[in-house]
Every structure is written in structure tokens, then in C-alpha cells.
């Protein structure tokens, strides 16, 4: 990793050891610099791999909800708008980081939690298994 | 949103007010249970919207290395392995949490930052804007 | 408790249109998606289509120019419209609950939840 | 669309014996991305709604009893009754998932001799 030097104006910190803990301003800072409108909006819809996004909500988890991604078919969607079997629609997935509240039901106490989440779908060639 | 009934062995928190600053374990649990092997490993490649992975690096923020997706073509690759213009490569986004160290180059200090990211790519529909 | 239940008239004449609301209780619309199967008397099922949670809708091409789904949030109901009736389509007809299954990224089309049915008889 | 063929289409059985439900699919129900089996089956007793038993091949559904199972790959499915109950009687219907429009067995009749 890349070493940083310290800035002498850092708060103290009295665990210097792992489970690191850690102070975090929950006051988010939206670094978005995308000014499109559209974004991935419609793109579930207009997708040759079209998926719907099912509402994941847990209060002991923040943000309490993620937005998750189903792929509609297992086929892809061709230009007469039929389901071509012969290409697959797969989930894209990403690990993400999110905050669970530890101990349970604390308010000011987190542990970071990695999840995998599925954000959209995408259309790929089927790997053919040859059969020796 | 959800009222939680609050713990009592909660540790105590000064700043009662926002911004709001909380404690965070940074000892990462992972939660992904899903045992799909294949995942999204291989699909930037088998994908008729094919994209490229770029890293992302950034000492400042947690994770600092994040792997950003661009599409390769502007069109779709058909069936013959070409590119085709009349379907439009667009990446999926999404927005994700990340730790910021405030105020820099701290250690044990951090403020929650939303940053816009590329997934992967799908293959859509091209919007059709009629001229009057 | 999951529950879904068809209503609607009993007997529809024929060239006219098929009407059925399905209500439903103890799940969240917003997750699930809903799909109309029918069984004409002493056959085996039949899907005609689904609405999507987010509203989106897929047909049975065999109805595809007749059939329209769709759901009424607010009073959590969904409605099968079939036009054009004939003799052949008298059957019971149910709506199902495709079944949800967390970490798992593609919509299912089997159906872990179904109505009581409701009998459709097209006649003059 | 995609054909579902039963076999047998009546099927007389002994209560404790076991019972076997044969399923054939006109097209393979194996997804290539994850190597599942997209078949389901379904009991529809008398005078009731299907319900769900098994799926993805040989999940069982929540609450279904062990004694039924379900196996095949491809086009090739078989429900397994391990020791008949005289609850288990009604018509049994297999279903694939995957190709739209999704489609059922024309059932298989299981009665008490």
C-alpha cells in the first residue's frame, strides 16, 4: 500500500491496534460529478438483458436500502423482441461496502460490511461445454 | 424510516448532532454468501457489450483501489462478431459508499462519501429522436 | 399470511371481455411479481402471463393480442383483461405469486403461492 | 413452445410403498451460466390449488416433506415418492422455468389402489 504521512492535526485515536476503529462523519459528501439526468435510469427496460429492481431494505444496515437487480429471462432479447435462447442474460454484480450496526440496534457503533450486490444484467455468448 | 428500539450496552457518543459522527470497526465481514462461482469474472469479455476495467487508485479513500468499467464500443457486437451501430454499449452505474479521510492524509478519520461508479456495460435500444 | 384470491364474474359471453381482480395480502407488492394461469375443466395449466414488480409485463404469445395485466398498488390488487372470448376459454383462473428468492439475480417463473381459482364459463 | 411430457399419466399406488413421476422437456432446462436445472413440480389435490413441492430440479420448497425428491438433468426429471401417505394423493404436475411461455406436464394422477 501507499504510506501517508500523518497529519499532526488528526484526532487521537487510542486503539492502535486490529479491529481497527475508526471515527466517520456519517454527514455524506456527494462526490456525483455526473450531471446526466438519464444515467442508468431506463436502462433496465431498453436492455437486450432487461432486469427489474426489487427494494432491499434493513434498518440495521446503512444505507438501510440497496436496490438489487433481477435479470428478467435467462435468454436475451433480439431485434424482433423475442427471447433468444441461444445468448444468456447474467447479472452484474460489484462488492460494496456498507455499515452494520454493531453491537445490534446502536446507533453510533458500526462494523463495515462487504456485500455483493447485483446492479443490472448484461447479455453474453454462452460457453459452450464440449462433452469429450 | 424505522424507529430501533436503541441497545443499552451502545458505547457513548458526544456529537448528539449532525453532522453526525459515529465509530466504525473497520475489520470487514464479508456477508457474500452467494456460492456462484462464476460471479461477473468473465462477462466483460463474453459480453455483446463488451468493456474494459481501469483502476482506479486513491490513497485518501477507503477502499482506495476501485476498478472502474468502460465500455469498448460505442455499438453492440452481433452475431457475427461485429459492431453494431444500431444497438448502443452502455454502462450500468452505481452509486457506492466510501470513506474519505478527513481531515487528510488521518489515519483514524474519516467522512462518508457517495461516488458515482461503472459496473459493467449492457446493450441497448437506441433512443429515437424524431425531428418535427 | 400469504394470500391471494380471485374474484370476477362467473360467466362471460362470448366476443366479449374477461374481467378478474386478484387481491392480495401478507407480501409486498413491490417485491413480488404476480403471474394469471388458467386450467380449462379436466386439463392440465396453462400461464398466460405475468406483471413484473416494478409493473413491466410478459404474455403467452398464444394471448398476447388480447391479454393485458396490471396492478392497482393502493388497493394491492391485480387485474386479467381478455378479450374476444370464445367457448375454449372457460376455465378456472388463477393467479400465483412467483416465488422470490434473496441472493438469487434473475426473476423465477414458478409460482410458491396461488389463489383459491375462480371458474370462468364463456356462454351465450 | 417448449413440450412437457408425463409419464405415467395415472399412477395407482400402496400406501408406505415409494412412486416415481418420469418428466421429459422437448428442450435441455440446463442454464449453461449456473448449471441449474429449471424445473419445477407441483401437487394439485383434489378440489385445491396447485402447490408448489420442489424446484430448481430438486429444491425442496419450505415445508414439503423429505420424502419427496426430485432429480434429472437436461431433458430427463424424475419425482420421487419415497414411502406413499394417503395425503399424497391428487394430480402432480411438472413445469419448466425457463424458456417463456413457461409450460406444464399434462399431470400425472396418483391414487390409492
Known amino acids: 500500500g501507499i504510506t501517508i504521512p500523518r497529519n499532526p492535526g488528526c484526532p487521537n485515536s487510542e486503539d492502535k491496534n486490529f479491529p481497527r476503529t475508526v471515527m466517520v462523519n456519517l454527514n455524506i459528501h456527494n462526490r456525483n460529478t455526473n450531471t446526466n439526468p438519464k444515467r442508468s435510469s431506463d436502462y433496465y427496460n431498453r436492455s437486450t438483458s432487461p432486469w427489474n429492481l426489487h427494494r432491499n431494505e434493513d434498518p440495521e444496515r446503512y444505507p438501510s436500502v440497496i436496490w438489487e437487480a433481477k435479470c428478467r429471462h435467462l435468454g436475451c432479447i433480439n431485434a424482433d423482441g423475442n427471447v433468444d435462447y441461444h445468448m444468456n442474460s447474467v447479472p452484474i454484480q460489484q462488492e460494496i461496502l456498507v455499515l452494520r450496526r454493531e453491537p445490534p440496534h446502536c446507533p453510533n457503533s458500526f462494523r463495515l460490511e462487504k456485500i455483493l450486490v447485483s446492479v443490472g444484467c448484461t447479455c453474453v455468448t454462452p460457453i459452450v461445454h464440449h462433452v469429450a | 424510516g424505522i424507529t430501533i428500539p436503541r441497545n443499552p450496552g451502545c458505547p457513548n457518543s458526544e456529537d448528539k448532532n449532525f453532522p453526525r459522527t459515529v465509530m466504525v470497526n473497520l475489520n470487514i465481514h464479508n456477508r457474500n454468501t452467494n456460492t456462484n462461482p462464476k460471479r461477473s469474472s468473465d462477462y466483460y469479455n463474453r459480453s455483446t457489450s463488451p468493456w474494459n476495467l481501469h483502476r482506479n487508485e486513491d490513497p485518501e479513500r477507503y477502499p482506495s483501489v476501485i476498478w472502474e468499467a468502460k465500455c469498448r464500443h460505442l455499438g453492440c457486437i452481433n452475431a457475427d462478431g461485429n459492431v453494431d451501430y444500431h444497438m448502443n454499449s452502455v454502462p450500468i452505474q452505481q452509486e457506492i459508499l466510501v470513506l474519505r479521510r478527513e481531515p487528510p492524509h488521518c489515519p483514524n478519520s474519516f467522512r462518508l462519501e457517495k461516488i458515482l461508479v461503472s459496473v459493467g456495460c449492457t446493450c441497448v435500444t437506441p433512443i429515437v429522436h424524431h425531428v418535427a | 399470511q400469504v394470500q391471494l384470491q380471485e374474484s370476477g364474474p362467473g360467466l362471460v359471453k362470448p366476443s366479449e371481455t374477461l374481467s378478474l381482480t386478484c387481491t392480495v395480502s401478507g407480501f409486498s407488492l413491490p417485491s413480488h411479481s404476480v403471474s394469471w394461469i388458467r386450467q380449462p375443466p379436466g386439463k392440465g395449466l396453462e400461464w398466460i402471463g405475468i406483471i413484473w414488480n416494478q409493473g413491466g409485463t410478459d404474455y403467452n404469445s398464444a394471448f398476447k393480442s388480447r391479454v393485458t395485466i396490471s396492478v392497482d398498488t393502493s388497493k394491492n390488487q391485480f387485474s386479467l383483461k381478455l378479450s374476444s372470448v370464445t367457448a375454449a376459454d372457460t376455465a378456472v383462473y388463477y393467479c400465483?405469486?412467483?416465488?422470490?428468492?434473496?441472493?438469487?439475480?434473475?426473476?423465477?417463473?414458478?409460482?410458491?403461492?396461488w389463489g383459491q381459482g375462480t371458474l370462468v364459463t364463456v356462454s351465450s | 413452445d417448449i413440450v412437457m411430457t408425463q409419464s405415467p399419466l395415472s399412477l395407482p399406488v400402496t400406501p408406505g410403498e415409494p412412486a416415481s413421476i418420469s418428466c421429459k422437456s422437448s428442450?435441455?432446462?440446463?442454464?449453461?451460466?449456473?448449471?441449474?436445472?429449471?424445473l419445477a413440480w407441483y401437487l394439485q389435490k383434489p378440489g385445491q390449488s396447485p402447490q408448489l413441492l420442489i424446484y430448481?430440479?430438486?429444491t425442496r420448497q419450505s415445508g414439503v416433506p423429505d420424502r419427496f425428491s426430485g432429480s434429472g438433468s437436461g431433458t430427463d426429471f424424475t419425482l420421487k415418492i419415497s414411502r406413499v401417505e394417503a395425503e399424497d394423493v391428487g394430480v402432480y404436475y411438472c413445469q419448466q422455468s425457463y424458456y417463456t411461455p413457461y409450460t406444464f406436464g399434462q399431470g400425472t394422477k396418483v391414487e390409492i389402489k
Open positions: 400465483a405469486r412467483n416465488a422470490y428468492i434473496t441472493d438469487y439475480y434473475y426473476e423465477n417463473y414458478f409460482f410458491d403461492a
Open positions: 430448481w430440479t430438486s
Open positions: 428442450q435441455s432446462l440446463l442454464f449453461s451460466e449456473n448449471q441449474k436445472n429449471y
